[in-house]
């Protein structure tokens, strides 16, 4: 289809680079959630940061190309890196508007599908992108 | 300041192919924007052809698809318009054009290209 | 394609009076609110020039003569007050939709 992507876009403070220029914020009227309609792909991404007691939000935004994970409808996130013992970052990627704005659902911490603790270590920032 | 310049041959016979240049200063083709192809035949009507943005992804007008192809050279900041297959109707004046978002704040000058026998 | 029909074809305006150009699209350039439709300046023997983008928003050092306004359809760029190197060919361009299209033009002149 021509009309292009719309997705949640969000950058935790600290974290290291911009997926901005990837698309045009909009004016949706409300500070939050922030809206931004993707230039180079029809696909939204998201960033989760699992630890033993919550899920915190990271990133969220446009991809800059259509990838395999793309055609998908929800957001279901997969282990991607361990930014720090204890914290799992997980990332989804989906192709329909607004479709990153959350999760479906995430596994609990240490269950199987998440890397073990012998798993990518990365300094705080660059793990973001090596998720991405 | 960023700017851009065309350059490439004036004159392509019909069923050849039609090769130009943009040439960008003041600015790295890698860091940002997409880098546009835009022509305005005689007449004045405008018609976007395609981008290659800094990543290095293509999209082209569909009405071209198959004839299109933008390339770019990051050594020398500079990215390609070849238009295979021309005609007397690809006879146009072909501008390169810089976008950060999907408007065009930064063209070239333009170059004439007639396809001609 | 999004066909933008732009009227009138040419208009000749008195210096100091008020200049109105409208382009309308065949199907809507918003997206959730956000109108996707800009506007260029064109003189003899140049490129377009960016004036106003995403239907109202001026370009930096455009002056505040240019004016733009609409959504979803129906937008319009204002010249008030229209001066001598106002006379040019303006061109609306939408982006809500692939591929991006261009009006076919307004050209302004002086009375």
């Known amino acids: 289809p021509p009309n292009r992507r719309t997705c949640v876009f969000f950058e935790a403070p600290g974290v290291r680079g911009s997926t901005k220029t990837l698309g045009e914020l909009l004016d949706t009227g409300t500070e939050l959630p922030r809206a931004i309609r993707c230039l180079y792909s029809r696909c939204c991404f998201g960033i989760w940061n699992l630890t033993q007691d919550r899920a915190q939000v990271e990133m969220q935004g446009c991809r800059d190309s259509d990838e395999p994970g793309c055609e998908s409808l929800h957001c279901d996130p997969s282990p991607r890196a361990h930014p720090s013992p204890g914290s799992t970052l997980f990332t989804c990627s989906c192709g329909t508007d607004f479709c990153n704005a959350n999760y479906s659902h995430l596994p609990p911490p240490g269950s199987p599908g998440t890397p073990g603790s012998q798993g990518p270590q990365a300094a705080p920032g660059e793990s973001i992108w090596m998720a991405l | 300041d960023v700017q851009l310049q065309e350059s490439g041959p004036g004159l392509v016979k019909p069923s050849q192919s039609l090769s130009l240049t943009c040439t960008v200063t003041?600015?790295?083709?890698?860091?940002?924007?997409?880098w546009n192809w835009i022509r305005q035949f005689p007449g004045n009507k405008l018609e976007w052809m395609g981008y290659?943005?800094?990543?290095?992804?293509?999209s082209y007008n569909p009405s071209l698809k198959s004839r299109i192809s933008i390339t770019r050279d990051t050594s020398k900041n500079q990215f390609f318009l070849q238009l295979n297959s021309v005609t007397t109707e690809d006879t146009a004046t072909y501008y390169c054009?810089?976008?950060?978002?999907?408007?065009?704040?930064?063209w070239g000058q333009g170059t004439l290209v007639t396809v001609s026998a | 394609d999004i066909v933008l029909t732009q009227s009138p074809a040419s208009l000749a305006v008195s210096l100091g009076q008020r200049a109105t150009i409208s382009c309308r699209a065949s199907?809507?350039?918003?997206?959730?609110?956000?109108?996707?439709m800009h506007w260029y300046q064109q003189k003899p023997g140049q490129p377009p020039k960016l004036l106003i983008y995403?239907?109202?928003n001026l370009e930096s050092g455009i002056p505040a003569r240019f004016s733009g306004s609409g959504s979803r359809t129906d937008f319009t760029l204002t010249i008030n007050p229209v001066e001598a190197d106002d006379v040019a060919t303006y061109y609306c361009?939408?982006?809500?939709?692939?591929?991006?299209?261009f009006g076919g033009g307004t050209k302004l002149e002086i009375k």
């Open positions: 995403r239907a109202s």
């Open positions: 003041g600015y790295s083709i890698t860091s940002d924007f997409a």
């Open positions: 290659i943005n800094f990543s290095g992804s293509t």
């Open positions: 361009q939408q982006s809500n939709e692939d591929p991006y299209t």
């Open positions: 054009a810089g976008s950060r978002y999907s408007w065009f704040a930064y």
């Open positions: 199907e809507s350039v918003d997206t959730y609110g956000n109108s996707f």
